[in-house]
């Protein structure tokens, strides 16, 4: 059963701009990849960006670009005002659904300060599996 | 125009490990996943696994699952490939390949590749 | 685990020649499909990705077609310079790739 795991990055350099990290470990065939985010603008969860293999991406504000990092990865770069992503980003939990075959949907979750750069193979916050 | 370099040949015993590395220079490194390749005396090649390395996260090929161990440090541009409990069947040349695509649809070729690492096991 | 399998595994073709080496996938992998080339000694060499996108570089001479299960890489006159092993590539589900074609002097 394949697993999904989630990294958050923060630029070094521009605290305004970051990037979530997302793939799934093992043999699967992906169909559809959605990241999204919690407690950002309110209680409810928001659709950053969907990605279709074939068809391409198709991404919403605060995302600026998602692509494809590995036939098995994606990355979605977030960039927002400055006062606004301190104040925003403490209580925001980002989220990647794989949906796969023949595995079903695959779902991980993690907040940005939970994320470690230096991990060598993260493992995820939270793993929901509907099959 | 990024170009990979590999260290050098290795000899090595049965049991034991080895570690290759593969430097990057004249590019991105972080946002650009390396795999790593065999290819056996007269042998086909076979994709051992690979790592992102601005997440640090490696997916290995089942065959390879627990033996090899795929890393990279982004302060060297420099990606690692260490397999152990070496046995005689791993003598081959080990290569590091650049993952690269298009980015929008999931379309991901190798280009370029290192020159490659000759590792012979052997008592 | 997705399977490759390429056909003929040698062959032997004189310079002018039109050559074609099949690659067939044991399920359907759309068109993740990439050609390389590699001569002794060497680091393979990218010649088609995609299926039919030729890379940067590469002479017109190469092609490649197919979608599904079926591909074909072709060489539509055989220079001195192609005398070499041919690789398919799958990138739909990780990355496998097929046994290899040997192209030899006739």
């Known amino acids: 059963s394949p697993e999904v795991w989630v990294q958050v990055q923060m630029e070094a350099t521009n605290l305004s701009s970051f990037s979530v990290h997302c793939g799934v470990l093992g043999y699967s065939l992906i169909s559809l990849v959605t990241v999204s985010c919690e407690g950002f603008v309110d209680a409810g969860r928001t659709k950053l960006a969907v990605l279709h293999p074939e068809f391409g991406t198709q991404q919403w504000a605060p995302a600026r670009q998602a692509h494809w990092e590995t036939p098995n990865s994606v990355s979605v770069t977030l960039t927002m005002g400055q006062s606004k992503a301190r104040s925003s980003l403490a209580n925001t939990t980002f989220c990647c659904e794989f949906v796969t075959f023949p595995h079903g949907s695959r779902v991980a979750c993690r907040d940005l300060h939970r994320s470690d750069p230096g991990l060598s193979a993260p493992t995820p916050a939270l793993n929901l599996q509907a099959d | 125009q990024v170009q990979l370099v590999q260290s050098g040949a290795e000899v090595k015993k049965p049991g034991s490990s080895v570690k290759v590395s593969c430097k990057a220079s004249g590019g991105t490194f972080s946002s650009y996943a390396i795999s790593w390749v065999r290819q056996a005396p007269g042998q086909g090649l076979e994709w051992m696994g690979g790592i992102i390395p601005i997440s640090g996260t490696a997916n290995y090929a089942q065959k390879f699952q627990g033996r090899v161990t795929i890393t990279a440090d982004e302060s060297t541009s420099t990606a690692y490939m260490e397999l152990s409990s070496l046995r005689s069947e791993d003598t081959a040349v080990y290569y590091c390949a650049r993952d690269t695509g298009r980015g929008y649809t999931r379309h991901f070729w190798f280009d370029p590749w290192g020159q490659g690492t000759l590792v012979t096991v052997s008592s | 685990d997705i399977q490759m399998t390429q056909s003929p595994s040698s062959l032997s073709a004189s310079v002018g020649d039109r050559v074609t080496i099949t690659c067939r996938a044991s399920q359907s992998i759309s068109s993740y499909l990439n050609w390389y080339q590699q001569k002794p000694g060497k680091a393979p060499k990218l010649l088609i990705y995609?299926?039919?996108s030729l890379q940067s570089g590469v002479p017109s001479r190469f092609s490649g077609s197919g979608s599904g299960t079926d591909f074909t890489l072709t060489i539509s006159s055989l220079q001195p310079e192609d005398f070499a092993t041919y690789y398919c590539q799958q990138s739909d589900i990780l990355y496998t790739f097929g046994g290899g074609t040997k192209v030899e002097i006739k």
């Open positions: 995609a299926a039919s």
